[in-house]
Interface confidence: low
Amino acid sequence: MMTGTIETTGNISAEKGGSIILQCHLSSTTAQVTQVNWEQQDQLLAICNADLGWHISPSFKDRVAPGPGLGLTLQSLTVNDTGEYFCIYHTYPDGTYTGRIFLEVLESSVAEHGARFQIP
């Protein structure tokens, strides 16, 4: 039975050219996290494997940095980075938990750098 909950940074916004940290946190379960995948729509951005460590997709190596923790830092943001991001926690014995973050990259300086955690 899956009892865990994924908490995420929710809907966030950032300025073009800036950076943003995508964060997810798995709580309310004692399941072991074996791997976390970060995906943008249908693209795999990065993997953090409990045994092997981080792997960043070569397409994003210039703009994606691992961490902090199991999070992901996006740098040199462009308007094209606007969209849904997913953290996919592979756990044993529970299975897979998925969290969703929506990032909006704004041209102007009105972006709010929210760091709140929301449960979707």
């Epitope: 494997n49 092997l52 460590g53 792997h55």
Partner: nanobody, 119 residues
């Protein structure tokens, strides 16, 4: 130190196929991803494809649907199956490993194998 040896290059007609191999030896216990890159004459080296131990694969847009990367962990060998080859695929192809070191960059390089696509 890891040593990488590529093979399988050659001359092929447009639309043809080739299979490149990359054999790794040395301190291979920290090899967690293998990648293929290429460098055409007068151009910068560009990433082509990579495979993570466990099977995840990535491809450059220019080769998606035509190239397939794979790895045989038991043989410490990576492969690049290249189909529907085009003249613009002509280049020296290099394999490299990603070790999850501090840099996250591919290193070291093999000596390369030349692929020529021409009629």
């Amino acid at each position: 130190e890891v040593q990488l040896v590529e093979s399988g290059g050659g001359l092929v007609q447009p639309g043809g196929s080739l299979r490149l191999s990359c054999a790794a030896s040395g301190s291979i216990d920290r090899i967690n991803a293998m990648g293929w890159f290429r460098q055409a004459t007068g151009k910068e080296r560009e990433w082509v494809a990579s495979v993570l131990r466990g099977g995840y694969t990535w491809y450059a847009d220019s080769v998606k649907g035509r190239f397939t990367i794979s790895a045989d962990n038991s043989k410490n060998t990576a492969y690049l199956q290249m189909n529907s080859l085009k003249p613009e695929d002509t280049a020296v192809y290099y394999c490299a490993r990603d070790s999850y070191s501090t840099s996250f960059w591919f290193d070291p390089w093999g000596q390369g194998t030349l692929v020529t696509v021409s009629s």
